[in-house]
């Protein structure tokens, strides 16, 4: 339902997507029970969310992942929300570190992030892990999103 | 405070409840500092929020619960956030995941979850969780709410 | 962008600040990536959010900390959300709870917190955690905001 | 588009079991879940359980929780429903659906539909 033409909701929630790809940065789909209200917010080659109206924005993220402490590195999971805007240098906006379970051959664990940020038009939002491997992409259990305030 | 008659604010939240219940359903109450803001989304069966207008809405839920390793089964500790609508599939629109801890009697832990979804008229939300009788319901600990964008 | 003078957007987002004080309330700074969008909502004395006009919020908080469970108390690490109403007892709106970990010298791990309230004319919301000295204060790792809406 | 056809329906005293199956073919890819409604004489559609093709997640109407198991055979295609501590109340004609994979939350998406399968619970 629209606010009115000048001011369209704007909002999206997109579900996690396995990729081969080495890269810390998690891809995104639009499947499942997506939120895409319109073409004010579209998702860039999987991995970004980016506005093309300037405002404050609730962004939120949750990862769900499988990691033992044994096979792991030392330093903990983190999932960090990240943003992008046209010639600025790339921010963290939010981060959370859990550090890996005992049980065996992994233990599950679930992190969310959220939180209220000026984005402009052009920027992108867009989520790292230290461990892509490790991410659950069952249903439900990962995905990311935005609303305009 | 509302927007206007064409355009009211719709929000709630809602306390846990504790259930003699055997369901995994988890059971809430409008007490302590709860939001009920009008009749267009109501609690029912102390179990499921419904809303009566379409829209896209925030839906979130927290639960903190105490499970032992040792205690529990192999299986980790699962909250689903979870959308029945009228004549469609119930889906699983959220879940998180946390191990069981190794701490005695038991390990608390708290789960949050969070995202926009697009609500028929008449659709319900409710949380589903793995073992209720593992949930915490001192102040605070344990709610689940909306908001209507 | 402002939905009008009658109705401005209201929305706060501060950022840890370590402290030398002994207090269990967090500490707050309006510091990085920020958000404060008018004098309808402040941050006072570095610890709580008031608001000057009555509504529903959400109001959200993100604490990661380290702890060890051989070097903490026996009770787990709880982040509280607390709102103070003039004329009123302080209440706990929001609790999370997390054991502490056994990976030496301690374990990271997060807690988000979030919800819809009635706040009035004058309300400060603030964060109360177990042991202040265990949060982490690195970018990102723990903020403090809310919406009104 | 994709193809359903059920199987399994039939006559069963109370307390009795039926086990259905619903064989799919065509855009097996496109589909996201599949599960079952049932519709008694002069009822609405309810549902009864769902199955997430991409990882077997499932989700249950209240009215048979603990007595039905909804199940997927990926190598075949094809999803089960077991049903057990039938009840005369269960009587209906049982339908397969299926739900294409890209839905979204902001469309109501038509699912594919079987035939229908009718299943007596009588003594």
């Known amino acids: 339902m629209q606010k009115g033409d000048q001011n369209p909701q704007i909002a999206a929630h997109v579900i996690s997507e396995a990729s081969s790809k080495t890269t810390s940065v998690l891809q995104w789909a639009e499947k499942g029970y997506y939120t895409m209200s319109n073409n004010l917010v579209t998702l860039e080659n999987g991995k970004q969310l980016t506005v093309k109206r300037q405002g404050l924005y609730y962004i939120y993220a949750q990862v769900t992942f499988c990691s033992n402490r044994e096979a792991s590195s030392q330093a903990p999971f983190i999932a960090s929300l990240c943003l992008k805007s046209p010639g600025r240098f790339e921010r963290i906006l939010l981060r959370a570190a859990n550090t890996h379970s005992s049980a065996k051959p992994c233990g599950q664990q679930s992190i969310h992030l959220g939180g209220v940020f000026e984005l402009q038009p052009g920027a992108s939002v867009f989520v790292n892990v230290t461990d892509p491997s490790q991410v659950s992409h069952g249903t439900g259990f990962t995905s990311f999103g935005l609303l305009k305030l | 405070m509302q927007k206007g008659d064409q355009n009211p604010q719709i929000a709630a939240h809602v306390i846990s409840e504790a259930s003699s219940k055997t369901t995994s359903v988890l059971q809430w109450a409008e007490k302590g500092y709860y939001t009920m803001s009008n009749n267009l989304v109501t609690l029912e069966n102390g179990k499921q929020l419904t809303v009566k207008r379409q829209g896209l809405y925030y839906i979130y839920a927290q639960v903190t619960f105490c499970s032992n390793r040792e205690a529990s089964s192999q299986a980790p500790f699962i909250a689903s956030l979870c959308l029945k609508s009228p004549g469609r599939f119930e889906r699983i629109l959220l879940r998180a995941a946390n191990t069981h801890s190794s701490a005695k009697p038991c390990g608390q832990q708290s789960i949050h979850l969070g995202g926009v979804f697009e609500l028929q008229p008449g659709a319900s939300v409710f949380v589903n969780v793995t073992d209720p009788s593992q949930v915490s319901h001192g102040t605070g600990f344990t709610s689940f709410g909306l908001l209507k964008l | 962008m402002q939905k009008g003078d009658q109705n401005p957007q209201i929305a706060a987002h501060v950022i840890s600040e370590a402290s030398s004080k002994t207090t269990s309330v967090l500490q707050w700074a309006e510091k990085g990536y920020y958000t404060m969008s008018n004098n309808l909502v402040t941050l006072e004395n570095g610890k709580q959010l008031t608001v000057k006009r009555q509504g529903l919020y959400y109001i959200y908080a993100q604490v990661t900390f380290c702890s060890n469970r051989e070097a903490s108390s026996q009770a787990p690490f709880i982040a509280s959300l607390c709102l103070k109403s003039p004329g009123r007892f302080e209440r706990i709106l929001l609790r999370a709870a997390n054991t502490h970990s056994s990976a030496k010298p301690c374990g990271q791990q997060s807690i988000h917190l979030g919800g819809v309230f009635e706040l009035q004319p004058g309300a400060s919301v603030f964060v109360n955690v177990t042991d202040p000295s265990q949060v982490s204060h690195g970018t990102g790792f723990t903020s403090f905001g809310l919406l009104k809406l | 588009e994709v193809q359903l056809v059920e199987s399994g329906g039939g006559l069963v005293q109370p307390g009795g079991s039926l086990r259905l199956s619903c064989a799919a073919s065509?855009?097996?890819?496109?589909?996201?879940?599949m599960g079952w409604f049932r519709q008694a004489p002069g009822k609405e559609r309810e549902f009864i359980a769902v199955i997430y093709w991409r990882d077997g997640s499932s989700l249950y109407a209240d009215s048979v929780k603990g007595r039905f198991t909804i199940s997927a055979d990926n190598s075949k295609n094809t999803a089960y429903l077991q049903m057990n501590s039938l009840k005369p109340e269960d009587t209906a004609v049982y339908y397969c659906?299926?739900?294409?994979?890209?839905?979204?939350?902001?469309?109501?998406?038509?699912?594919?539909w079987g035939q229908g399968t009718l299943v007596t619970v009588s003594s």
């Open positions: 659906a299926a739900e294409p994979y890209g839905s979204g939350s902001s469309l109501i998406s038509e699912y594919d």
């Open positions: 065509g855009s097996i890819s496109s589909v996201n879940a």
